[in-house]
Interface confidence: low
């Protein structure tokens, strides 16, 4: 595939990444889903400055972004490392993040109406942001 | 052992309130997800609550929404409904069950009855 | 709303033979990113709760007989009981947990022939 150079109609270029932002809702694995069909992932907060981004963006609306632990451990859907990596949770949060992975726990990492995030139930339908790296090679053929 | 035991139905007049008890015991209580559910007599099964484990996260089925609410006393291993605004169609029994991805503990139901 | 359809409304199967119940849902319950359908199967006989009986619709529960199993993915589920047990006959019902409201199948009978 050819590497992106810009990003697709309706979404909007920052920092070489490219980011769509959803007006409706959707369960956290409908958003993931969506995102992944768009060849892209649900948001990846690297650093403050991408955070202050998505935030800018999404006003003070529960909005999913790419964290989850419904298989034990915190885990961002492109692989970044959780333990290491930036992290903006409320205070106290997450709180229920016994790691069951077994359904019906707040597996599901979001913004908050302030930005900083909270775990919540991943069927809730909230609106999500979908990220996919300018860099990254896309799936459509080279032009010939 | 693991046990669920409702109590607190029983007949009330339309537009009255009645308030349900779930106690709890045999398992780390705060660990899970409740839920409760009701049957209408002769009926199937209808979901209509559930509440996190902390309690910081409930859902209401749009059925109940604006007259019923959930909570829980994780000190005291006790899930409770309260129920406002009672209608007939609200008459079933209420199972109180604990959510462990399928629910895996039912008590045995306590029978709201709504009649003028 | 996901609603969830079963079929038949009821069977009659004899002592020892094959049980088949399905399930439908209106919209995939599969959830790609742990590989799981957020599917489940309970019992109901008169006067008594649910019991579980299968959950990720193909997780048997603890101290449920083997001859009850669970199959099917994304929309489509089946309950097997592979021989028919007189303590058998009952209610059936499906339960999907993957989206709010969590709703049940209207539940299937099953009577002996």
């Known amino acids: 595939g050819s590497e992106r150079t810009c990003c697709p109609v309706n979404w909007v270029e920052h920092e070489r990444s490219c980011y769509w932002f959803s007006r409706s809702g959707k369960a956290w694995a409908d958003a993931d889903n969506y995102c992944r069909l768009e060849d892209a992932h649900l948001v990846v907060v690297t650093s403050w400055e991408e955070q202050k981004f998505v935030q800018h963006h999404i006003g003070p609306v529960n909005t999913w972004m790419g964290l989850h632990d419904q298989n034990g451990p915190w885990k961002w859907v492109d692989g970044t490392d959780y333990e290491t990596g930036f992290k903006n949770w409320r205070p106290e949060q997450p709180d229920d993040w016994y790691g069951h992975g077994l359904g019906g726990g707040e597996d599901c990492a979001h913004f908050t109406d302030d930005g900083r995030w909270n775990d919540d139930v991943c069927q809730r339908p909230y609106r999500w942001v979908c990220e996919t790296e300018l860099d990254k090679a896309s799936q459509e053929p080279p032009l010939l | 052992q693991v046990q669920l035991v409702e109590s607190g139905g029983g007949l009330v007049k339309p537009g009255g309130s009645l308030r349900l008890s779930c106690a709890a015991s045999g398992f780390t209580f705060s660990d899970y997800y409740m839920s409760w559910i009701r049957q209408a007599p002769g009926k199937g099964l209808e979901w209509v609550l559930y509440i996190s484990g902390s309690g910081t996260t409930t859902y209401y089925a749009d059925s109940v929404k604006g007259r019923f609410t959930i909570s829980r006393d994780n000190a005291k291993n006790s899930l409770y409904l309260q129920m406002n605004s009672l209608r007939a169609e609200d008459t079933a029994v209420y199972y109180c069950?604990?959510?462990?991805?399928?629910?895996?503990?039912w008590g045995q139901g306590t029978t709201v009855t709504v009649s003028s | 709303d996901i609603v969830m359809t079963q079929s038949p409304d009821s069977l009659a199967v004899s002592l020892g033979e094959r049980a088949t119940i399905n399930c439908k849902s209106s919209?995939?319950?599969?959830?790609?990113?742990?590989?799981?359908?957020?599917l489940a199967w309970y019992q109901q006989k008169p006067g008594q709760p649910p019991k579980l009986l299968i959950y990720?619709?193909?997780t048997r529960e603890s101290g449920v007989p083997d001859r009850f199993s669970g199959s099917g993915s994304g929309t489509d589920f089946t309950l097997t009981i592979s021989s028919l047990q007189a303590e058998d006959v009952t209610v059936y019902y499906c339960?999907?947990?993957?989206?709010?409201?969590?709703?049940f199948g209207p539940g299937t009978k099953v009577d002996i022939t």
């Open positions: 069950a604990r959510d462990r991805g399928g629910l895996d503990v």
């Open positions: 919209q995939s319950v599969f959830f790609h990113s742990n590989n799981k359908n957020y």
């Open positions: 339960q999907q947990y993957f989206s709010l409201p969590f709703t």
């Open positions: 990720w619709a193909s």
